[in-house]
Amino acid sequence: LRPSRVYKPEGNTKRALTLKDILNGTFSYKTYFPNWISEQEYLHQSEDDNIVFYNIETRESYIILSNSTMKSVNATDYGLSPDRQFVYLESDYSKLWRYSYTATYYIYDLQNGEFVRGYELPRPIQYLCWSPVGSKLAYVYQNNIYLKQRPGDPPFQITYTGRENRIFNGIPDWVYEEEMLATKYALWWSPDGKFLAYVEFNDSDIPIIAYSYYGDGQYPRTINIPYPKAGAKNPVVRVFIVDTTYPHHVGPMEVPVPEMIASSDYYFSWLTWVSSERVCLQWLKRVQNVSVLSICDFREDWHAWECPKNQEHVEESRTGWAGGFFVSTPAFSQDATSYYKIFSDKDGYKHIHYIKDTVENAIQITSGKWEAIYIFRVTQDSLFYSSNEFEGYPGRRNIYRISIGNSPPSKKCVTCHLRKERCQYYTASFSYKAKYYALVCYGPGLPISTLHDGRTDQEIQVLEENKELENSLRNIQLPKVEIKKLKDGGLTFWYKMILPPQFDRSKKYPLLIQVYGGPCSQSVKSVFAVNWITYLASKEGIVIALVDGRGTAFQGDKFLHAVYRKLGVYEVEDQLTAVRKFIEMGFIDEERIAIWGWSYGGYVSSLALASGTGLFKCGIAVAPVSSWEYYASIYSERFMGLPTKDDNLEHYKNSTVMARAEYFRNVDYLLIHGTADDNVHFQNSAQIAKALVNAQVDFQAMWYSDQNHGISSGRSQNHLYTHMTHFLKQCFSLSD
């Protein structure tokens, strides 16, 4: 037996992190996002659950809704009507999938100081929202959309086709929620509250994924979800718009699909209201390299929505799929005709373009070997966006302003020099016309949220600076974090290395690679985190490395699209390349290298362990994908095409984890999965296990009964991380 090696941080009054610290969330941080209700006013839920109103200009603040009112219905969330007369209170939150949940809603009348009693809302509701003006309510109940002109009025039923697991109105089905919309809703009010647009998803022909939910009963329940796997029948989508002023006179009007899209299988990807009678729809071919943006206008005379061909804008990728993870959405100018949009330039970097008439005549307004990430707000004279331009670090985010008024266009970085060491990764939240905005900095130092003047960019006040967290971390030995790049051939790979306290280059340390590596993801980010891997470095003396290989985002399409139609090849190759480079650095114990990942990361870690290189002693895969045929159509096909003989079946087959079962013989493999995973089905791990058994390869496994893709219930999470810690310490011969 090899002697166990115990890592002891040297004489220091500071203590190392413990696993308990991580599991208890002792070192979690806070952010502050104002809930804007006007150009200079916002709401915020206080620590003690009062809903507080703030006016930036008058410095006025008062409780608009007390915690006792919240508590009276066990409310955990709220929403103020635009006319400020009512608040909906949300309680009985019941999670469904990643974004979706059902809840009970109560309407509180702020004028009377009491709950609205007449025509109470049914329960549970799938989605509810106020109109942008006044206090109309739209909600989805049992897959149908209802409308209330006022909270106390009887509801008007807009759709009648809704049926569980068959037809969804105003809410997405599973695959659209997870892979296309990334929301729990599929309805959008026009800016003046006159029209309501919504999507109908017909899942009648979609195959069902069924799995057992064990619960506490004598018999398990079966969960059935229409879930199109790669190559399967997809949802049929239709978009409708209803006039909410006279919903009974004229029914919902269908918005036509562009001809070039309707000719084969297609997806709806997003809807953006441009003005009160103009709407912009985005569509995508099933083979996701062609996207069409269609601008439609209301024709009063026909009582219909018209989408002229000359208002169709095509975006096409010749090297991969359209867009990043999703196709970007347009940010329209005040003229309701021209818009700004992020898409790839001729060098393959995603940049902001200004489209006035045709995409061909688009004016590129950002350029360089970096990428524009998101357009936050377009006003009369400014455009605010985020990018990773500053100092050439792809894992940073700064906020920029481009002046677009009556002077030469100029670009200014709003955040680059604010708190340069502490803050290198920002997002922002703007008031309606950007008179004020909040900046939320996620690190690499302690997160901080600040309020700013939209004209001058001056900081007005600190909203949250995580003082308590700063104090509680004073006596903690945190590891050192480095973000650097390594070169191999013509490729550059950014990596983040987490080094144990008192790290000594002349010593040898075990190495754990944490990998995700999915297309258009990014792991090497300049953000603050105290999590499991922080603990492993701090307490157990393990060096942790995260590497962004080919297929990851924000470094141009050449790097991103390298994995197109061949998932599982370069992502793995690049992790292996990085490990070899880390060994060359001289402080890694070659005999003690491990890899772990979750979801796509579980797929990559499994393939890396089965690479036959002998680099890894052990590894963990949590909820891994094992074959792209088992995963959702929208995701798998975006990157892999179709699993058909005349398309890409061959690579679907040879990129499975099962195909490499034999290669697990010389590694210690821990396979973990939740049995109620609606996303990456337990089937994936069941098939890996079956292949390993068939190959007579020993491995370790753990399932989590009734846990989904996040394995997030308190007890399960504690068990999971404790179990993985034991496995790793055993692998690295670290004593308990």
Partner: antibody, heavy 121, light 107 residues
Framework: QVQLQQPGAELVKPGASVKLSCKAS????????LHWVKQRPGQGLEWIGE????????NFSEKFEIKATLTVDSSSNTAFMQLSRLTSEDSAVYYC??????????????WGAGTTVTVSS | QIVLTQSPALMSASPGEKVTMTCTAS?????MYWYQQKPRSSPKPWIF???NLASGVPARFSGRGSGTSFSLTISSMEAEDAATYYC??????????FGSGTKLEIK
């Protein structure tokens, strides 16, 4: 089509003044700002200044603030630049050019053929 | 004021050759603009907002850069591309400044 017409040449004596014209055709002069650019023989381009024909507002390069005067006669759709106290250093080709300041353009889209000014006794 | 330095001052290229000329600003600018001028002719707008080709400019031309470093590239030199190219910026406006020019000749 849109054009800016400038006389071909002006011969002036040192110490004198010259008034260069720039006649716009194909568009209304008050719709766009007009800039003047100097180019000495075999040399690069040097910005002199600009005038907004709609309101007469102007900006100059510091170097030309005393040297140049910019005016517009909207009735004849013509812009003028007067150069005073001329020296041999002022011998150059002078271009008038229109600024396309539509959103995100901001470039000089139409140029006159240039007037060659020769300062010689 | 912002000074623009163009390099090289003079260069020659054979037909089909890739050509790159640079423009360096003395301090950071938001965007760069380029003009082409042929002998005895007025300048013509060539590239605006760093990377956009003006109307009628062949697709073999491209513009790149940010901060203080900008470039104009011709992917495959043609005889008609022989000219002097000037960069120009608005960031210190007023004044507007031009670079001293790069004269491109055909071999």
């Amino acid at each position: 089509q849109v054009q800016l017409q400038q006389p071909g040449a002006e011969l002036v004596k040192p110490g004198a003044s010259v008034k260069l014209s720039c006649k716009a055709s194909g568009y209304t002069i008050t719709s766009y700002s007009l800039h003047w650019v100097k180019q000495r023989p075999g040399q690069g381009l040097e910005w002199i200044g600009e005038i907004n024909p709609a309101n007469g507002d102007h900006n100059f390069s510091e170097k030309f603030e005393i040297k140049a005067t910019l005016t517009v006669d909207s009735s004849s759709n013509t812009a003028f630049m007067q150069l005073s106290r001329l020296t041999s250093e002022d011998s150059a080709v002078y271009y008038c050019t229109r600024l396309d300041d539509s959103r995100f353009h901001w470039y000089f889209d139409v140029w006159g053929a240039g007037t060659t000014v020769t300062v010689s006794s | 004021q912002i000074v623009l330095t163009q390099s090289p001052a003079l260069m020659s290229a054979s037909p089909g050759e890739k050509v790159t000329m640079t423009c360096t600003a003395s301090s950071s600018v938001s965007y760069m603009y380029w003009y082409q001028q042929k002998p005895r002719s007025s300048p013509k707008p060539w590239i605006f907002l760093t990377s956009n080709l003006a109307s009628g400019v062949p697709a073999r031309f491209s513009g790149r850069g940010s901060g203080t470093s900008f470039s104009l590239t011709i992917s495959s030199m043609e005889a008609e591309d022989a000219a002097t190219y000037y960069c120009q910026q608005w960031s210190g406006y007023p004044p507007i400044t031009f670079g001293s020019g790069t004269k491109l000749e055909i071999k």
